[in-house]
Interface confidence: medium
């Protein structure tokens, strides 16, 4: 409102494009760059491509987990992903299982009956 | 289609609101901004399963997952740069860290996604 005309007042303003948009990502490249910088040593530097690469990795892994968890929820005819679906997705995938060793709160257990406990019908042990 | 009702859609900006809580002495104190990846996780979910929602507990788990993987990659990349006497962490250090940390096919696919994003980013500069 009535401020001084700046140097570029005649030129059409170009819309700011985020680094995430430029890389075709959903995850925040700028924020990840900031976090990377805060994690390095006092005089350590972080290149721009490191943040883009990291954001892409995090987004890919997120998509992979959500893809499998969403399928688990659909198999159980539920419209919303819960910790149980995350547990089934992660533990049901060899590679994700080895990557995520943490216990998932509210994830429950993976159904498993040891072979030795599955007796033939009619051969059940009597106590 | 709408996500399930009880799955609260994350707030824009993915930060908790900076509300001012009243202190006993009458002065207002700023509540700390807590950053999370909820907004981005939600966006990705809508790409892979447009008609599926996510519970707040599951979102919390996803947020912890992203933070955990980030810490592992950043830590490994930082160590690699230090060992190789490099003052800058580049996508090369991140890629090596990913290859060291992720198992088999997961690493292969992740590396391909990372390379693709960097290529797109550098070509659009």
């Amino acid at each position: 409102a009535g401020g001084k005309a700046g140097k570029d007042s005649g030129k059409a303003k170009t819309k700011a494009v985020s680094r995430s948009q430029r890389a075709g990502l959903q995850f925040p490249v700028g924020r990840i760059h900031r976090h990377l910088k805060s994690r390095t040593t006092s005089h350590g530097r972080v290149g721009a491509t490191a943040a883009v690469y990291s954001a892409a990795i995090l987004e890919y892994l997120t998509a992979e987990v959500l893809e499998l968890a969403g399928n688990a929820s659909k198999d159980l005819k539920v419209k919303r992903i819960t910790p149980r679906h995350l547990q089934l997705a992660i533990r049901g995938d060899e590679e994700l299982d080895s990557l995520i060793k943490a216990t998932i709160a509210g994830g429950g257990v993976i159904p498993h009956i040891h072979k030795s406990l599955i007796g033939k019908k009619g051969q059940q042990k009597t106590v | 289609p709408e996500p399930a009702k009880s799955a609260p859609a994350p707030k824009k900006g993915s930060k908790k609101a900076v509300t001012k809580a009243q202190k006993k002495d009458g002065k207002k104190r700023k509540r700390s901004r807590k950053e999370s990846y909820s907004v981005y996780v939600y966006k990705v979910l809508k790409q892979v399963h447009p008609d599926t929602g996510i519970s707040s507990k599951a979102m919390g788990i996803m947020n912890s997952f992203v933070n955990d993987i980030f810490e592992r990659i950043a830590g490994e990349a930082s160590r690699l740069a230090h060992y190789n006497k490099r003052s800058t962490i580049t996508s090369r250090e991140i890629q090596t860290a990913v290859r060291l940390l992720l198992p088999g096919e997961l690493a292969k696919h992740a590396v391909s996604e990372g390379t693709k994003a960097v290529t797109k980013y550098t070509s659009s500069k």
Partner: nanobody, 123 residues
């Protein structure tokens, strides 16, 4: 749950193109990751290309830049466009699907469903 039928194979010259089709019968085709594998005479079945439900495509290094995989969720079809064919592309091509929408799971051969093969011969 999903039946797959591959077609479009044939005998072509080196440098020619060919388009393979995979027709899928069954429910919720759009949620499947689809892929192509091939088996050359006397060799093991190998991964060629895959397309996920949402996250794009992945290719074997040997076909990158020459082959293109695509998917039509309306027609329940998956395609493999093969350009600049080489004699080493000869083999039986199989289409595959997995109910996990993940190309990674498909590319490791953990497919739930397989189609019968279609022969591609490059002379």
């Amino acid at each position: 749950q999903v039946q797959l039928q591959a077609s479009g194979g044939g005998l072509v010259q080196a440098g020619d193109s060919l388009r393979l089709s995979c027709a899928a019968a069954g429910r919720s085709f759009s949620s499947y990751a689809m892929g192509w594998f091939r088996q050359a005479p006397g060799k093991e079945r190998e991964f060629v290309a895959a397309i996920s439900r949402s996250r794009g495509v992945t290719y074997a290094d040997s076909v990158k830049g020459r082959f293109t995989i695509s998917k039509d969720n309306v027609k329940n079809m998956a395609y493999l466009q093969m350009n600049s064919l080489k004699p080493e592309d000869t083999g039986v091509y199989y289409c595959a699907a997995t109910s996990s929408g993940s190309t990674r799971q498909l590319s490791t051969g953990r497919s739930n469903y397989w189609g019968q093969g279609t022969q591609v011969t490059v002379s």
